[in-house]
């Protein structure tokens, strides 16, 4: 039992790791200019998307490079616990927190807002510089969508790196696992062609979601054969000439649910890597 | 003045640095063993590639797969001078070879062997399970682009390293350079379409000119458009029919010059890298 | 649909220039690696590659004829020009023009124009 | 140079039109079909594949400087004028075949 409650302590655990936060401000300042920097790079490769073949290339090419870049930026995430591990067995030890409140408040003061930022930036600079879709909801919902494949992403590393001492081992085996997940997101392949044997894999893939999301996102309602009225006179099976008919090539479900159910994943992902780094966490109090 | 030659040296250098390779064979082994898996993956994944819209994704996503692969995979080139640094400095000073013995020994015996059996494993692999153009120069071809580019990253990786001596802060450098150089290289942006102020990035791409004698040599005569009669149907301006539309598009240029440039700019790089990589070892010896 | 259209003088004398017109659709002369070949080919002989124009206005002449040739374009019109000053009845033949990439044989032709040079 | 500027067949007959180039040409090899009054039509490019709508029966090979065009079992729509074209340097048409019923 705890003289103080839940609510305190995490409210004075998120306190101090923002402090630290603020305190230490190279990393955060560095982290940011890096992404503004990558943004405008991006921005400015990309600047100004044509509504022909090469723009579907494009489009496809950015989407994807976004989705992976958060999602290989977030193996840094496996450092939130293991750096501190020590602290932390001290300090849950001496009764300072439970560690359901240490968990939380990392979570709050540190993650949220370190992966937050990234999808923020990269949307508000990329989003305009390319001429992506011009609708407010297609613009929250890129942010929405490269927050939560950061959310998951970072889940996953605090998954794989609680409770460890060492980063290195862990940042080796996120890797691995995201050079997996990249092949099967979508892009280099056409999942609609792997075996089946070998298709359920894609379902673990979190760039997979992601970029399946800000495809559908932005694809929907396009046209890509400047001059021809695609939607009435397209004789041809093997152009492609709108959004539609590129989404449904990649085996991309065109409906509301095809857009939502990705970030659904996401969000169960997030879930369960999450209560596996709190159970990693409080098997180790157990042996420390 | 040295009482042996630069031969003698050279050899004698190259047996040493091969009995350490014999002598220590876990790692070698384990190189070979993890290209072997990651070769039959990605066979599995993009087994028996299709001729229609699918089989250009496929073609142009496993061919960028592998490029890039060749280039981030010969990070680990990084440690040839590093690790040895003070044993270099120290039979450098007591007079036992040349710096240049010493360089080329540990290319020949180390570099080359190491950086060759990869691209012949994948190539034997893939090739067949994939069922790439079965015609045996372009089998051939595929191996050596493969080879090529992975001398050039690994001489990237010396001209950054020699001279070093923590891997870390090279391997950092190596590997934004590669997320870099993997923009530029043709598959997630459309080289013609970007501007004329940011294209000539495109020139220091070591995946830019793999990947693009790979498509050269996979592409060229190739059909995509099963059961069309495309010169009197031509309702399909907007579809790739052909392996030569999608490499106009791409900005390949057809002919035969437009393969081989690839093998010679990359020959140019490995030429210069390691004439870098030579000069710091010079350099390194002045201040020893 | 792509199509290509000839259109020439039908006869001229000897010692005039030959001016020639491909009107084309279905395509445009400013997208990347789009080239416009013209061909000829006399009457009962075979086939003689001209000249060719592409997308960045770079052009290339047959070796044994190029002091003799001249080929533009006009993007907007969606048209190429060849000119051939001071003809002769060597120069009778079928005038064809031909859509292409900038390294690829010729898939898209048009149905050709018939030219005299006759006194 | 092509060969053989013409060439008699019986419908049902395997025949076979070559080309040499003065040099190397990597394959860069195109073959084309013209029936009187028409413009030619593309049947063969890169040596050996087939233009779609092209029919099976028809086929290409060679490298280097040699190159054959076969058709495997002649048809009275085939009868036409056969060319060779090597697109590796600019573009140069072979003479031609001219191909009839016996």
């Known amino acids: 039992s705890y003289t103080t409650s839940f609510c305190h302590q995490l409210r004075w655990v998120s306190k101090r790791s923002f402090k630290n936060l603020l305190g230490n401000p190279q990393a955060s300042i560095a982290q940011i200019i890096v992404t503004v920097i990558l943004g405008l790079v991006i921005g400015a490769i990309y600047f100004g998307l044509n509504n022909d073949s090469t723009g579907i290339q494009n489009r496809a090419g950015v989407l994807f490079f976004l989705t992976t870049n958060q999602c290989f930026s977030s193996v840094s995430a496996v450092e939130l616990f293991v750096v501190e591990k020590k602290l932390f067995i001290h300090e849950y030890i001496s009764g300072y927190y439970r560690v359901s409140s240490y968990f939380f408040g990392k979570l709050l003061s540190d993650l949220l807002p370190m992966r937050m930022l990234p999808s923020i930036i990269f949307t508000c600079i990329v989003y305009f510089m390319l001429g992506l879709k011009p609708t407010a909801d297609a613009f929250f919902i890129m942010m929405f969508t490269l927050m939560m494949v950061a959310y998951s992403a970072s889940s996953m590393a605090l998954a794989i790196a609680a409770g460890q001492s060492v980063v290195s081992v862990a940042t080796l085996l996120m890797t691995i696992c995201f050079v997996f997940m990249m092949i099967f997101s979508g892009l280099l392949v056409n999942l609609t062609t792997i075996a089946s044997w070998l298709s359920w894999l894609q379902y673990f893939s979190i760039p997979r979601y992601g970029f399946t999301a800000l495809q559908h996102n932005e694809f929907l309602g396009q046209n890509f054969c400047p001059g021809l009225n695609a939607t009435v006179n397209n004789t041809c099976n093997y152009a492609t000439c709108t959004g539609e008919e590129y989404l449904t090539k990649q085996g991309i479900d065109l409906s509301p649910w095809g857009l939502w159910k990705n970030h659904v994943a996401l969000a169960c992902m997030i879930v369960i890597f999450l209560t596996i780094a709190y159970l990693k966490l409080l098997f180790l109090k157990k042996y420390s | 003045s040295y009482t042996t030659s630069f031969c003698h040296q050279l050899r004698w250098v190259s047996k040493r640095s091969f009995k350490n390779l014999l002598g220590n064979p876990q790692a070698s082994i384990a190189q070979i063993i993890v290209t072997v898996i990651l070769g039959l993956v990605i066979g599995a994944i993009y087994f028996g590639l299709n001729n229609d819209s699918t089989g250009i994704q496929n073609r142009a996503g496993v061919l960028f797969f592998l490029t890039t692969n060749q280039c981030f995979s010969s990070v680990s080139a990084v440690e040839l001078f590093v690790v040895e640094k003070k044993l270099f400095i120290h039979e450098y000073i007591s007079g036992y070879y040349r710096v240049s013995s010493y360089f080329f020994g540990k290319l020949l015996s180390d570099l080359l062997p190491m950086r060759m059996l990869p691209s012949i494993i994948f190539t034997c692999i893939v090739y067949f399970m994939l069922g790439l153009k079965p015609t045996a120069d372009a089998f051939f071809i595929m191996m050596f682009t493969l080879m090529m580019v992975a001398y050039s990253a690994s001489s990237m990786a010396l001209a950054i390293a020699a001279g070093q001596s923590v891997v870390s802060v090279a391997t950092l450098l190596m590997t934004i350079c590669f997320v870099f150089m993997m923009i530029f290289s043709g598959l997630l942006v459309n080289l013609t379409t970007i501007a004329s102020w940011l294209s000539w990035l495109q020139y220091f791409s070591i995946p830019r000119y793999g990947f693009t004698a790979l498509q050269h040599n996979e592409f060229l005569g190739q059909n995509f458009c099963p059961g069309l009669n495309a010169t009197v149907n031509n309702t399909c301006n907007y579809a790739t029919c052909t392996g030569e539309e999608y490499l106009t598009k791409q900005g390949i240029d057809l002919s035969p010059w437009g393969l081989w440039k690839n093998h010679v700019a990359l020959a140019c790089m490995i030429v210069i890298f390691l004439t870098i990589a030579y000069l710091k070892l010079l350099f390194l010896k002045k201040y020893s | 649909q792509v199509t290509l259209k000839e259109s020439g003088p039908g006869i001229l004398r000897p010692s005039h220039t030959l001016s020639l017109t491909c009107s084309f659709s279905g395509f445009s002369l400013t997208t990347y690696g789009i080239c416009v070949s013209w061909i000829r080919q006399p009457s009962g002989k075979g086939l003689e590659w001209l000249a060719n124009i592409c997308w960045e206005d770079s052009k290339a002449y047959n070796p044994s004829l190029k002091n003799r040739l001249t080929i533009s374009k006009d993007t907007s019109n969606n048209q190429v020009f060849l000119r051939i000053p001071s003809v002769d009845t060597a120069d009778s033949a079928i005038y064809y023009c031909?859509?292409?990439?900038?390294?690829?044989?010729?898939?898209?032709w048009g149905q050709g124009t018939l030219v005299t040079v006759s006194s | 140079t092509q060969s053989p500027p013409s060439l008699s067949a019986s419908l049902g007959d395997k025949v076979t039109i070559t080309c040499q180039a003065s040099q190397n040409i990597n394959k860069y090899v195109a073959w084309y079909q013209q029936k009187p009054g028409k413009a030619p039509r593309l049947l063969i490019r890169?040596?050996?594949t087939l233009e779609s709508g092209t029919p099976s029966r028809f086929s290409g090979s060679g490298s280097w400087r040699d190159y054959s065009f076969s058709i495997s079992n002649v048809e009275s729509e085939d009868i036409a004028d056969y060319y060779c074209l090597q697109y590796v340097n600019l573009w140069t048409f072979g003479g031609g075949t001219k191909l009839e019923l016996k």
């Open positions: 031909a859509r292409v990439f900038n390294n690829y044989p010729f898939p898209y």
């Open positions: 890169y040596t050996s």
